[in-house]
């Protein structure tokens, strides 16, 4: 059955209630210089209204503080209102390493990110940090890498490993959850000149992730004890016509080309899904495509296999698919899939259909294919035109969290966290934010607060309290010392 009745119950005490933000552009200078100027001034209030410095007097200044960054203040205010336990945000690789290598490290950018994390911890909010978050419009690579073919160049993977190592070193004492790359399976939108370019770029992204994970595992895990994964775009697929066998096959093929493409090599075999490889090869043989998945060496398979500590999925909607044979040598045509918009479904302004039961099906599919592992939904949300009473978002959150709860309580999926997308919207972009672009709060915040404080959808009489030991797993003394670090 697609939809089942709502359940009453709670998520575990260690469940991560998160909110996701995309790339945080670091502020280059703290915006409160008044605290760093040691001079005394007299204000000529009745005359020329200027400040005149008093010579020979030097005042004690206070050291720079994280909250001197205006941006950080704003984020903290928003996060405090969200009442989340976790904040997922992305670093800007190009800002941290403008030359693409360690020859020029932007220490100020790293200080800014360290401030975001440490100030969050003071509010009891832990960070999940994404190292690389490309978007359709902007690849987000340092310029020198961008102009040297970006992800088509295998050396970009090595550059990424060096960048990841720097971030682990500088932030890893505070950050326990890392995402290397956000939605590498969506870079096909950019590297789409040919299927072979798409698969070549994907291969280098997989290698980049694996190199970063291996580095963390070898060098940083023993002392930092964190966990590292990558976030896959993971919409569910349903046959447009449930009575057509070809539509069922198309739905499974969508999942193979979209999720298994990255999940299979990392979670399971070290190689691409056999179904995907065979499908592309059969089209090649029939002269319908010149695409081919890269052949992996034994060393590459060993490098990739098992390089995830948890499964991270970005899930927004369910797509209705049908089979349509397409000629051409691009990723989109290689999969022979046509999408159908079901106009009877509740949809957002960007035509994202609200189909809550898709997330539960996705979680079961992942467990069936890749085993019983910790799963985080690292982004999930909908765009809603309303600037105050965003009822569509409230409905979406309530219904999707219901299905996640069913997956946890009934299907026994090891779901560890849900991160709503996103904290604040950007000007002239689809309205996914809990806050407007000028930081005005929407009513969905109260709704999410209520779910978080209840740990889900409890029975009338059940307690939402967690014991202190479970709720505060961080060592408070360690945390105190860490926060005092310059």
């Amino acid at each position: 059955k697609e939809s089942t009745p709502d359940v009453q119950g709670q998520f575990p005490c260690d469940f991560s209630w998160g909110v996701t933000e995309s790339v945080l552009k670091p502020e280059s200078v703290a915006s409160s210089p008044q605290f760093s100027d040691p001079h005394l001034y007299v204000w000529n209030a009745t005359g020329n209204r200027l400040l005149h410095r008093v010579e020979g007097v030097r005042l004690k200044t206070r050291p720079a503080q994280c909250t001197d960054f205006v941006n950080i203040k704003k984020q903290l205010e928003m996060l405090a209102r969200m009442k989340v336990t976790h904040y997922r945000f992305a670093l800007d690789w190009a800002s941290v390493l403008p030359t693409g290598n360690l020859s020029a490290v932007n220490r100020q950018a790293l200080r800014y990110y360290r401030c975001v994390v440490s100030e969050g911890l003071k509010l009891g909010i832990s960070a999940m940090v994404t190292l690389y978050y490309p978007t359709h419009a902007h690849l987000g690579l340092p310029e020198p890498l961008l102009h040297a073919d970006g992800w088509l160049n295998p050396s970009t993977a090595e550059a990424f490993q060096a960048y990841a190592g720097l971030c682990f070193q500088e932030l890893g004492d505070l950050v326990k959850l890392w995402i290397t790359i956000n939605e590498p399976n969506r870079l096909s939108d950019i590297y789409n000149r040919s299927g072979n370019d798409t698969y070549g770029a994907a291969h280098n992204l997989l290698v980049a992730h694996a190199l970063a994970w291996r580095l963390y595992d070898r060098q940083f895990r023993p002392s930092q004890r964190g966990a590292v994964s990558l976030s896959l775009h993971a919409d569910w697929a349903e046959p447009a016509n449930p009575y057509a066998d070809s539509h069922w096959r198309a739905a499974e093929r969508f999942l193979q080309f979209e999720i298994a493409w990255f999940a299979e090599p990392l979670f399971k075999t070290g190689d691409y899904p056999a179904a995907m490889r065979e499908y592309i090869a059969s089209k090649h043989r029939r002269g319908l495509s010149s695409s081919a998945l890269p052949r992996l060496t034994e060393a590459e398979r060993r490098l990739l296999k098992g390089t995830v500590d948890f499964c991270a999925l970005n899930h927004f909607t369910t797509r209705f698919v049908m089979h349509e044979q397409l000629a051409g040598s691009r990723y989109d045509s290689d999969r022979d899939i046509q999408f159908l918009q079901d106009i009877t479904r509740l949809s957002s302004p960007t035509r994202l259909a609200v189909i809550p039961w898709g997330v539960r099906k996705l979680l079961r599919w992942v467990r069936r294919n890749y085993g019983d592992m910790d799963i985080y939904i690292t982004a999930s949300g909908i765009d809603d035109q309303a600037l105050e009473d965003d009822r569509l978002r409230k409905y979406y959150l309530g219904k999707y969290l219901q299905e996640v709860l069913k997956a946890y309580l009934i299907d026994k999926v090891r779901i560890k966290g849900y991160y709503a997308f996103k904290l604040a919207e950007e000007k002239s972009k689809p309205r996914f934010g809990f806050f407007t672009s000028d930081f005005k709060a929407k009513s969905s915040i109260q709704f999410y607060n209520k779910v978080i404080s209840s740990r889900g959808f409890p029975f009338e009489n059940s307690s939402s309290r967690c014991s202190q030991t479970q709720e505060n797993t961080e060592c408070t003394v360690c945390l105190f010392l860490v926060q005092k670090k310059p």
Partner: antibody, heavy 122, light 107 residues
């Protein structure tokens, strides 16, 4: 800011070879981009001839493949077009350009040399 | 090779007018299309890449659109300095190919 400066003869005899040089300043040709040659015929038709990449890799337009070669001198930051056994039909203005085929701008030539007008005549 | 067909081949318009030039690709090129402007006696200059991305320094009166096989370049509020020949170029597959050009004149 990158600048491309071209040099080479304005007149070449049929069946001879044409050699053109593009000198690049403001950017190392080994750091990135695709260093490209394009020509424009008297009727203004533009033809993309081929490139040499930042890593030394080449691609030539199949219609010219056996007649041209694009090389470089990394120590001088120059790249070259060698066009063998030219005919009157190769009379054109030859441009060198910087192509950024996988970044931003996508698949485009964002900086051009001043052009060299070449006449093939005996 | 992909054939790029531009129309019209020449166009007369008055200052302040809005004009549109079209470019048709012989096969689907997604959004891999660039537009160049070549003023008389000058070298071609990049205006727009990836169908709609304005190159640095290009005035906002220029805009591009389209995907697949049909593309347009629009110039709103025509200025005297816009007198030039405009070329489209596909950047999907090698060899890259250009349209035959549209010569813009002022009435």
């Amino acid at each position: 800011e990158v600048q491309l400066q071209q040099s080479g003869p304005g007149l070449v005899k049929p069946s001879q070879s044409l050699s053109l040089t593009c000198s690049v300043t403001g950017y190392s040709i080994t750091s990135g981009y695709y260093w490209t040659w394009i020509r424009q015929f008297p009727g203004n038709k533009l033809e993309w001839m081929g490139y040499i990449k930042y890593d030394g890799g080449n691609y030539y337009n199949p219609s010219l493949r056996n007649r041209i070669s694009i090389t470089r001198d990394t120590s001088k930051n120059h790249f070259f077009l060698k066009f063998y056994s030219v005919t009157a039909e190769d009379t054109a203005t030859y441009f060198c350009a910087r192509g950024d085929y996988y970044a931003s701008p996508y698949g485009a030539m964002d900086s051009w040399g001043q052009g060299t007008s070449v006449t093939v005549s005996s | 090779d992909i054939v790029m067909t531009q129309s019209p081949s020449s166009l007369s318009a008055s200052l302040g007018d809005t004009i549109t030039i079209t470019c048709h690709a012989s096969q689907d090129i997604d959004v891999w299309l660039s537009w160049y402007q070549q003023k008389p006696g000058n070298v071609p200059q990049l205006l727009i890449s990836k169908s709609s991305i304005l190159h640095t320094g290009v005035p906002s009166r220029f805009s591009g659109g389209g995907s697949g096989t049909g593309f347009t370049l629009t110039i709103s509020s025509l200025q005297p300095e816009d007198i030039a020949t405009y070329y489209c170029q596909q950047g999907l597959s090698y060899p890259f190919t250009f349209g035959s050009g549209t010569k813009l004149k002022i009435k």
